[in-house]
């Protein structure tokens, strides 16, 4: 897998090219992660029939995956830059435990899964430089994460396949919403 954009602070720019602005770097980083998710979804869909399952059937899960809501200020109606930025960062931090779960779920795309995980960390770093209200964001509790990982890894094969599919689908949707919102900032 290629090195995630921004992973090396000494990014080599092409000659005569303007260095990327902070917003452009964030945009590029999200698109890089979305490409990674597409590759992972391809492997998941080839391996199981989860991708054919209806949204309704898949909705019957007890995963507490981050989701954008009206109150988060990320939609065009009621858009609020600071509230939205806090939601994006908080959501990405909450997704981290699920991305960690994905690390052992892929055979041929193992490197891609790692790249998605590490690139998400880089994205959070870019965004934390942009946020003014850092006190509104809390690092998720490691003890809670440890028990969630244990619980997810103890599921039967079918549930693990479904969990993998749901994480990828939800993370893709969350990033797409984030990308649209960040382009308004």
């Amino acid at each position: 897998a290629p090195v995630p954009p921004g992973e090396d602070s000494k990014d080599v720019a092409a000659p005569h090219r303007q260095p990327l602005t902070s917003s452009e770097r964030i945009d590029k980083q999200i698109r890089y992660i979305l490409d990674g998710i597409s590759a992972l979804r391809k492997e998941t869909c080839n391996k199981s029939n989860m991708c054919e399952s209806s949204k309704e059937a898949l909705a019957e899960n007890n995963l507490n995956l981050p989701k954008m809501a009206e109150k988060d200020g990320c939609f065009q109606s009621g858009f609020n830059e600071e509230t939205c930025l806090v939601k994006i960062i908080t959501g990405l931090l909450e997704f981290e435990v699920y991305l960690e779960y994905l690390q052992n779920r892929f055979e041929s795309s193992e490197e891609q899964a790692r790249a998605v995980q590490m690139s998400t960390k880089v994205l959070i770093q870019f965004l934390q430089k942009k946020a003014k209200n850092l006190d509104a964001i809390t690092t998720p509790d490691p003890t809670t994460n440890a028990s969630l990982l244990t619980k997810l890894q103890a599921q039967n094969q079918w549930l693990q396949d479904m969990t993998t599919h749901l994480i990828l689908r939800s993370f893709k949707e969350f990033l797409q919403s984030s990308l649209r919102a960040l382009r308004q900032m």
Epitope: V97, I124, Q125, Q128, L134, T139, P142, N145, A146
Partner: nanobody, 125 residues
Framework: EVQLVESGGGLVQTGGSLRLSCATS????????MGWFRQAPGKEREFVAA??????????YYVDSVKGRFTISRDNAKNTVYLQMNSLKPEDSAVYYC????????????????WGQGTQVTVSS
């Protein structure tokens, strides 16, 4: 190649202070959570403190027995993590290890990827 090198250990009297340092190389330091662990003779390695890679509230975590006495901090520019230990007690005597993880369960020793060789801390009464 990833390297973690601890320093700053030594012999100190009860109530004294020490500052441990852990210099890292070959690691994307700024996106790794850094932790300190300790192991006394005949005992299991135990979690002491960790500094998450973000700057948000709750980004440091301590075992109850060291809360209020030990402070973990990190310097991303120097790729170094520190453990300031005050009001030391004889039961703090152990080999102290620095470790790095990308796990979200960053108070679990088994989820750390890289480890240093350790530095001895002895607190005499």
């Amino acid at each position: 190649e990833v390297q973690l090198v601890e320093s700053g250990g030594g012999l100190v009297q009860t109530g004294g202070s020490l500052r441990l340092s852990c210099a890292t190389s070959g690691l994307a330091f700024s996106i790794y959570t850094m932790g300190w662990f300790r192991q006394a003779p005949g005992k299991e390695r135990e979690f002491v403190a960790a500094a998450h890679w973000t700057v948000f509230r709750g980004n440091t975590y301590y075992v109850d027995s060291v809360k209020g006495r030990f402070t973990i901090s990190r310097d991303n520019a120097k790729n170094t993590v520190y453990l300031q230990m005050n009001s030391l007690k004889p039961e703090d005597s152990a080999v102290y290890y620095c470790a790095a993880t990308r796990s979200t369960a960053w108070n679990s020793p088994q989820r750390y990827d890289y480890w240093g060789q350790g530095t001895q801390v002895t607190v005499s009464s």
